[in-house]
């Protein structure tokens, strides 16, 4: 009997309001045993995959998707989905990324901290297991 897969969660670091040219990292979370995490735009044909997974907590794994220099084209809704053999999960809730012009430059501390969407919200690093972040991406179309 196949298990019911929990919905993933999605969060953004340092937040969902990002100055133009700054970086943002999307964090996707799911259960133990995830093979692939996928970060999708509103169109499911635009996504990035990673198989570089971290052990986030005793009951969860996670992956990270980093955009080094945010542009206006990166604004919009994002969501996560994962593959745990033999099937794909449901999608997470959407998380809206807002990109704003700023006169303070990329380092100005005006991002909105710790935004997330989905059923679970835990700290995104488990210092015990030294695993920290996760990975790069296969493209259907470039997300970043």
């Amino acid at each position: 009997q196949e298990e019911d897969l929990p919905r993933p969660s999605i969060s953004a670091e340092p937040g969902t309001v990002i100055p133009l040219g700054s970086h943002v990292t999307f964090v996707c979370r799911g259960p133990v045993g995830v093979q692939t995490f996928r970060l999708e735009r509103e169109s499911r044909s635009t996504y990035n995959d990673t198989e570089d997974v971290s052990q986030a907590s005793p009951s969860e794994s996670e992956a990270r998707f980093r955009i080094d220099s945010v542009s206006e084209g990166n604004a919009g809704p994002y969501r996560c989905i994962y593959y745990k053999p033999p099937k794909w999960s449901e999608q997470s809730d959407y998380l809206e990324l807002l990109v704003k012009e700023t006169s303070g430059g990329p380092d100005s501390p005006d991002t909105e901290p710790g935004s997330s969407a989905g059923p679970t919200q835990r700290p995104s690093d488990n210092s015990h297991n030294e695993h920290a972040p996760a990975s790069q991406g296969l493209k259907a179309e470039h997300l970043y």
């Epitope: 990292t25 133990v32 045993g33 995830v34 093979q35 995959d49 990673t50 198989e51 570089d52 997974v53 971290s54 052990q55 005793p58 009951s59 794994s61 990270r64 998707f65 980093r66 015990h128 297991n129 030294e130 695993h131 920290a132 972040p133 996760a134 990975s135 790069q136 991406g137 296969l138």
Partner: antibody, heavy 120, light 107 residues
């Protein structure tokens, strides 16, 4: 089909250096963490090093036995994994495997290995 | 570092026997446990991940169980092609560590 082909092994004197290479094909290399695992003759398996992907800033991790002597690196444009081994010791004699992991650390795909012998 | 202990380094078994190989971690590894099979002269093969999940193509006579610190690999009916050394590995924390291996031999 996933293929991992290691090269660069051989006979080297103690305190010498060697660079191992691993050519990867049949999968999307740049979305996977990669590892080196070794096996001394007639012995068990020992994890050596791991490198994460670009979104992790290519973070690297090492076994204590090789820290400060070995360096793992990758070239995503060429789908290559490397292990630079310096100040080699006789106890580094082993078969070295290039391994693609899954699920955050299970060693899912193994190359055929390249043999390293450290002897005077 | 987390130590992985496989209590038996070798087993003498008969074809058709049920075989159980145990692996004990020095601390809780939260089911981040993999089992490998290595036949003589071959490279290791991943059999099971997350303590219980069978990899694609692995015969159903293999199964994994356990939690916390204690884990088990079971073979319901030993076949001649199962003669190999079996290793456990934890991937909860770096450095990843392997058990010393358990070699199955035919009586």
């Amino acid at each position: 089909e996933v293929q991992l082909v290691e090269t660069g092994g051989g006979l080297v004197q103690p305190k010498g250096s060697l660079k191992l290479s691993c050519a990867a094909s049949g999968f999307t290399f740049n979305i996977n963490a990669m590892n080196w695992v070794r096996q001394a003759p007639g012995k068990g398996l020992e994890w050596v090093a791991r490198i994460r992907t670009k979104n992790n800033n290519y973070a690297t991790y090492y076994a204590d036995s090789v820290k400060d002597r070995f360096t793992i690196s990758r070239d995503d444009s060429e789908s290559m994994l490397y292990l630079q081994m310096n100040n080699l010791k006789t106890e580094d004699t082993a078969m070295y495997y290039c391994v693609r992991d899954r699920y955050g650390g299970a060693m899912a795909y193994w190359g055929q290995g390249t043999s390293v012998t450290v002897s005077s | 570092d987390i130590q992985m202990t496989q209590s038996s380094s070798s087993f003498s078994v008969s074809l058709g026997d049920r075989v159980t190989i145990t692996c004990k971690a020095s601390e809780d590894i939260y089911n981040r446990l993999a089992w490998y099979q290595q036949k003589p002269g071959n490279v290791p093969r991943l059999l099971i991940s997350s303590a219980t999940s069978l990899e694609t193509g692995v015969p159903s006579r293999f199964s994994g169980s356990g939690s916390g610190k204690d884990y088990t690999l079971s073979l319901t009916s030993l076949q001649s092609e199962d003669v190999a050394t079996y290793y456990c590995q934890q991937y909860w924390t770096i450095p990843y560590t392997f058990g010393g291996g358990t070699k199955l031999e035919i009586k």
